[in-house]
C-alpha cells in the first residue's frame, strides 16, 4: 500500500523536510502533490509526468519545494505555515489513480528564557516570591531548577500558569539559591541563567564570645558578638545598659573590680528593620597575694612533736587548700586540717614527713600555690648497724668496723669494748688482733639535737678455733613442685670456707641444687619429696672445722593418686566390706568416701558389715591436703553377687 | 544412733595407775581414727592420745609420754586408756573422740566423759 | 608445739546481736582449724571444720573464715541457745592444741 513517511515529523522553523513516498506503483504515468488531506486542484503544489520528466507548478507552488523521480517532496525554508497534511495523487498508466497523505508540524526554534520575579528582597517569614519564566511561548512545556537540581516537593513550593510561574510562599534564608526556568518543546529546549533569591533574615539572637564571664583584675577584655543576618547587622555595646560603642567588638584592657556588670549586644538589620539583643554579666575579680606558709616548730623531733603548718595570708571567704610531695592529702590520723582548711596540723611527726609542702588560695578561676616547705624532722638514732656481719675472726688479721644509724642530724659516734670507751670516730680499726681482742664491741649512735643515743653490741671472737654452725631456712614447709628453699650457714665468718652434706654425703650434682654468696648458701629449686633429707653444712679454715645439728626439711606435696585396698572387686553376699583408702601426702591427707556418688564418712577406712547385692557400686575415695591446696581420687566398682553363684569370690574381711 | 560412753574415771592417789574404756556403738568404730581430749578444771582442753583405725599408729604429746598407752579392739568396739605414774595435773575429766578425716582431721564425735582424779 | 591463743576470754552479748571470736596460731596451719561449741555439763561439740566448713546440722548463722594464721568465728544474731564457750582447735597433725577457750555470756 501508498504511504508516506514525513522525515522528520516534526520540523523547526527554518529547515527541510523530507516527504518519503513508500511503495510507489510500478507503471506510472505520473503524480502530483497537494496541500491538505484531499486531491484539490485549488491547492496543488507540483505536478510530474514520467514521460516527459516535466514538473509543472501548481497554484500552492512556493518555490521551496522540490519534487524527486520516486515521487518524494522536499520542503526547504519550512515556515509555521508549512504546518499539516500533503496529499500524493498517483496516476498509473491503466489511468487507475491512488493517493496517500502524509504530515508534519513546524514549530519554532525556542529562545533563552529569563526569570522576572515580583520581589526582589523578600523578607524571610513574611513574603511570598513569585517568579516567571519568560517569554511565554506556545506549545512550550515550562520546567524549574533549583541548586540545578528538580524542585523538591515542599507545601511552600506552588507551579502556576501552565508551570510557567514558581511561586514560593514564607520564604526562609533555605530558600537562598540558585533558581533557573527551561523551555522546551519538540525540536528545542533553552534553559535561562540563574537567578539568586536575595531572602533577607534576621538578625538571630547574637552570641557574645569567648563564652568565659569570669576575669581577673589586670586582664583585658575582648568580647565579640555575632548574629546571623542578611545583610550583615549592625552591632552596637552598651554596659549596665549604657551605650558604649557600635562596634562588633569590645575591647577593654586592664580592666578592674569596677568593670564586673552586665554587657549587651545588640544586633540590628536595617533591611528588616529588626533588633536582637544579648546579655552576658561580666565579673572581675581582684587578684589575691601569692600564698605563703609559715610553721610553728622549724625542727621537730620524731615520734614527739607536732608541727603546724599555717597558710597565710587569712583572707576571708577563701577555700586553703594542701598538697604533700604534689598529691592531694592522703588520709591519715595523723593530718589534721583546722576548720576553714588553713591550718594543717602533723601529730607526731615521722622522717617521712619531710615534704615539700604547698598550700593554696583558690579563687573563682585558679588556684594561686605557695612556694614548697621542707620540714627538717629530727629523727634517730636508731639501731646503728656494726658492718662486716662477720663474728669469729683469726689471731693475726687487721679488725676494721665501721658502724652507721640513720639519723637527722647525723650521729656522732663512739667505740667501747666491754664497756670502756675507746674512741669517738665511726671506724674502729685495731691491727693484728690477738685472742685478747676478743669480747663485746659496742658502737654508740648519739644524735645531738634529739638528745638520743642507741647501742649495738657486737661478739667478736678471736680465735684459731671456728664455732659450731647453725643452719637458718627461709622457708620451713616449701610444696613439691612449687617451691624453692634457700637454706643459709651461720655464722658469716671471715677466711671461712663454707661446706654442704645431704644425708651424709657431699652435695649431689643438680640443676636443682644452687650454692652461692660463697657457698654460705644452698638454695633448692622446685623441691620435691626427695628433698626431705638432713641437711648439714660445715665451716672451716686452715686450723679448725665444725658441723651444725642436721636440719631435716618438712616438704609439703601430694595428695598422690589414692589406692584402694583389697584390690578385689567381687564380693560374696554376707562377706563384710572393709576398704582402706592411702594417699601419700604430707601433711596426713583428709578422707572420705562417696558410694555412687553419695557422700558416706570422712574416714580413712570404709567398712560395711554383711553386704547384700545392693551394696553393688561405685565406691569413690576422696583425698585432700589444705596445706598443698591439692585434691585427688580413685573410683573402685565393687559387685556383690548371691552366695555360691559365682567362683572365686572373695570371702570378705 | 552414735554413742560413745566412757567408763573407769575414779579418784587415785599419786603415782597410781588407771585404765579408762571407751564403748563405741551406732557407727563403723573400725573405720575411724580415735583419740583421747581431757579437760582441766580450769576449763583447759587437752588433747591425750591417738590411735589410727588399724591401731598400728600412735601419737602422745610430750606431757604424757612413757606414762599412758592407747590401744583399741575393733571386735569389741572399744578404746582404751592406760594410764600409770599418775601426776596431781593428770586431774580432768576424759572425753573419748572420734577423727574425721585421720590424723589431719578433728575430733568430730564426743563421749560424756569420765572423771579421773589424783590427789593424795 | 603450735600455739593457739584465742581472744576475747569471755563476752557478754545480747539476743540478736552478732559475736566474732578470734583464734591465732604461732604457725602456719592452712586451714586446719576446728571450732567448738561447749554447754554448760555438756561434752565439746564440733561446729566448724577447715576453718570454714560448718557441721552437719548447725545453723547458717555460725561461719568461719581465715587461714594461714588468722581466724575467726561469726554469730549472727545470736540465739540463746548460742550462749556458752567456744575452742579453737587446729588439726595440722599432732600434737593437737587447743585455744583457751571463749565463755560467751547473756548480758
Known amino acids: 500500500k501508498l504511504t508516506i513517511e514525513s522525515t522528520p515529523f516534526n520540523v523547526a522553523e527554518g529547515k527541510e523536510v523530507l516527504l518519503l513516498v513508500h511503495n510507489l506503483p510500478q507503471h506510472l504515468f505520473g503524480y502530483s502533490w497537494y496541500k491538505g488531506e484531499r486531491v484539490d486542484g485549488n491547492r496543488q503544489i507540483i505536478g510530474y509526468v514520467i514521460g516527459t520528466q516535466q514538473a509543472t507548478p501548481g497554484p500552492a507552488y512556493s518555490g521551496r519545494e522540490i519534487i524527486y523521480p520516486n515521487a518524494s517532496l522536499l520542503i526547504q525554508n519550512i515556515i509555521q505555515n508549512d504546518t499539516g497534511f500533503y496529499t500524493l495523487h498517483v496516476i498509473k498508466s491503466d489511468l487507475v489513480n491512488e493517493e496517500a497523505t502524509g504530515q508534519f508540524r513546524v514549530y519554532p526554534e525556542l529562545p533563552k528564557p529569563s526569570i522576572s520575579s515580583n520581589n526582589s528582597k523578600p523578607v524571610e517569614d513574611k513574603d511570598a516570591v513569585a517568579f516567571t519564566c519568560e517569554p511565554e511561548t506556545q506549545d512550550a512545556t515550562y520546567l524549574w531548577w533549583v541548586n540545578n537540581q528538580s524542585l523538591p516537593v515542599s507545601p511552600r513550593l506552588q507551579l502556576s500558569n501552565g508551570n510557567r510561574t514558581l511561586t514560593l510562599f514564607n520564604v526562609t534564608r533555605n530558600d537562598t539559591a540558585s533558581y533557573k526556568c527551561e523551555t522546551q518543546n519538540p525540536v528545542s529546549a533553552r534553559r535561562s541563567d540563574s537567578v539568586i533569591l536575595n531572602v533577607l533574615y534576621g538578625p538571630d539572637a547574637p552570641t557574645i564570645s569567648p563564652l568565659n564571664t569570669s576575669y581577673r583584675s589586670g586582664e583585658n577584655l575582648n568580647l565579640s558578638c555575632h548574629a546571623a543576618s542578611n545583610p550583615p547587622a549592625q552591632y552596637s555595646w552598651f554596659v549596665n545598659g549604657t551605650f558604649q560603642q557600635s562596634t562588633q567588638e569590645l575591647f577593654i584592657p586592664n580592666i578592674t573590680v569596677n568593670n564586673s556588670g552586665s554587657y549587651t549586644c545588640q544586633a540590628h538589620n536595617s533591611d528588616t528593620g529588626l533588633n536582637r539583643t544579648t546579655v552576658t554579666t561580666i565579673t572581675v575579680y581582684a587578684e589575691p597575694p601569692k600564698p605563703f606558709i609559715t610553721s610553728n616548730n622549724s625542727n621537730p623531733v620524731e615520734d614527739e612533736d607536732a608541727v603546724a603548718l599555717t597558710c597565710e595570708p587569712e583572707i576571708q571567704n577563701t577555700t586553703y587548700l594542701w598538697w604533700v610531695n604534689n598529691q592531694s592529702l592522703p588520709v591519715s590520723p595523723r593530718l589534721q586540717l583546722s576548720n576553714d582548711n588553713r591550718t594543717l596540723t602533723l601529730l607526731s611527726v615521722t622522717r617521712n614527713d619531710v615534704g615539700p609542702y604547698e598550700c593554696g588560695i583558690q579563687n573563682e578561676l585558679s588556684v594561686d600555690h605557695s612556694d614548697p616547705v621542707i620540714l627538717n624532722v629530727l629523727y634517730g638514732p636508731d639501731d646503728p648497724t656494726i658492718s662486716p656481719s662477720y663474728t669469729y675472726y683469726r689471731p693475726g688479721v687487721n679488725l676494721s668496723l665501721s658502724c652507721h644509724a640513720a639519723s637527722n642530724p647525723p650521729a656522732q659516734y663512739s667505740w667501747l669494748i666491754d664497756g670502756n670507751i675507746q674512741q669517738h670516730t665511726q671506724e674502729l680499726f685495731i691491727s693484728n688482733i690477738t685472742e685478747k681482742n676478743s669480747g663485746l664491741y659496742t658502737c654508740q649512735a648519739n644524735n645531738s639535737a634529739s638528745g638520743h643515743s642507741r647501742t649495738t653490741v657486737k661478739t667478736i671472737t678471736v680465735s684459731a678455733e671456728l664455732p659450731k654452725p647453725s643452719i637458718s631456712s627461709n622457708n620451713s614447709k616449701p610444696v613439691e613442685d612449687k617451691d624453692a628453699v634457700a637454706f643459709t650457714c651461720e655464722p658469716e665468718a671471715q677466711n671461712t670456707t663454707y661446706l654442704w652434706w645431704v644425708n651424709g654425703q657431699s652435695l649431689p650434682v643438680s640443676p636443682r641444687l644452687q650454692l652461692s654468696n660463697g657457698n654460705r648458701t644452698l638454695t633448692l629449686f622446685n623441691v620435691t619429696r626427695n628433698d626431705a633429707r638432713a641437711y648439714v653444712c660445715g665451716i672451716q679454715n686452715s686450723v679448725s672445722a665444725n658441723r651444725s645439728d642436721p636440719v631435716t626439711l618438712d616438704v609439703l606435696y601430694g595428695p598422690d593418686t589414692p589406692i584402694i585396698s583389697p584390690p578385689d572387686s567381687s564380693y560374696l553376699s554376707g562377706a563384710n566390706l572393709n576398704l582402706s583408702c592411702h594417699s601419700a601426702s604430707n601433711p596426713s591427707p583428709q578422707y572420705s568416701w562417696r558410694i555412687n556418688g553419695i557422700p558416706q564418712q570422712h574416714t580413712q577406712v570404709l567398712f560395711i558389715a554383711k553386704i547384700t547385692p545392693n551394696n553393688n557400686g561405685t565406691y569413690a575415695c576422696f583425698v585432700s591436703n589444705l596445706a598443698t591446696g591439692r585434691n585427688n581420687s580413685i573410683v573402685k566398682s565393687i559387685t556383690v553377687s548371691a552366695s555360691g553363684t559365682s567362683p572365686g569370690l572373695s570371702a570378705g574381711a | 544412733e552414735l554413742q560413745l560412753v566412757e567408763s573407769g574415771g575414779v579418784l587415785v592417789k599419786p603415782g597410781g595407775s588407771l585404765k579408762l574404756s571407751c564403748a563405741a556403738s551406732?557407727?563403723?568404730?573400725?573405720?575411724?581414727?580415735m583419740s583421747w581430749v581431757r579437760q582441766t578444771p580450769e576449763k583447759r582442753l587437752e588433747w591425750v592420745t591417738y590411735?589410727?583405725?588399724?591401731?598400728?599408729?600412735?601419737y602422745y604429746p610430750d606431757t604424757v609420754k612413757g606414762r599412758f598407752t592407747i590401744s583399741r579392739d575393733n571386735a569389741r568396739n572399744t578404746l582404751y586408756l592406760q594410764m600409770s605414774s599418775l601426776k596431781s595435773e593428770d586431774t580432768a575429766i576424759y572425753y573419748c573422740?572420734?577423727?574425721?578425716?585421720?590424723?589431719?582431721?578433728?575430733?568430730?564425735?564426743w563421749g560424756q566423759g569420765t572423771l579421773v582424779t589424783v590427789s593424795a | 608445739d603450735i600455739q593457739m591463743t584465742q581472744s576475747p576470754a569471755s563476752l557478754s552479748a545480747s539476743v540478736g546481736e552478732t559475736v566474732t571470736i578470734t583464734c591465732r596460731a604461732s604457725?602456719?596451719?592452712?586451714?586446719?582449724l576446728a571450732w567448738y561449741q561447749q554447754k554448760q555439763g555438756k561434752s565439746p561439740q564440733l561446729l566448724v571444720y577447715?576453718?570454714?566448713t560448718l557441721t552437719e546440722g548447725v545453723p547458717s548463722r555460725f561461719s568461719g573464715s581465715g587461714s594461714g594464721t588468722q581466724f575467726s568465728l561469726k554469730i549472727n544474731s545470736l540465739q540463746p541457745e548460742d550462749f556458752g564457750s567456744y575452742y579453737c582447735?587446729?588439726?595440722?597433725?599432732?600434737?593437737?592444741?587447743f585455744g583457751s577457750g571463749t565463755k560467751l555470756e547473756i548480758k
Open positions: 590411735i589410727n583405725s588399724g591401731g598400728g599408729i600412735t
Open positions: 582447735q587446729h588439726h595440722y597433725g599432732t600434737p593437737f592444741t
Open positions: 577447715n576453718a570454714k
Open positions: 551406732g557407727f563403723a568404730f573400725s573405720s575411724y581414727d
Open positions: 604457725e602456719n596451719i592452712y586451714s586446719y
Open positions: 573422740t572420734a577423727h574425721y578425716f585421720g590424723s589431719s582431721g578433728p575430733f568430730a564425735y
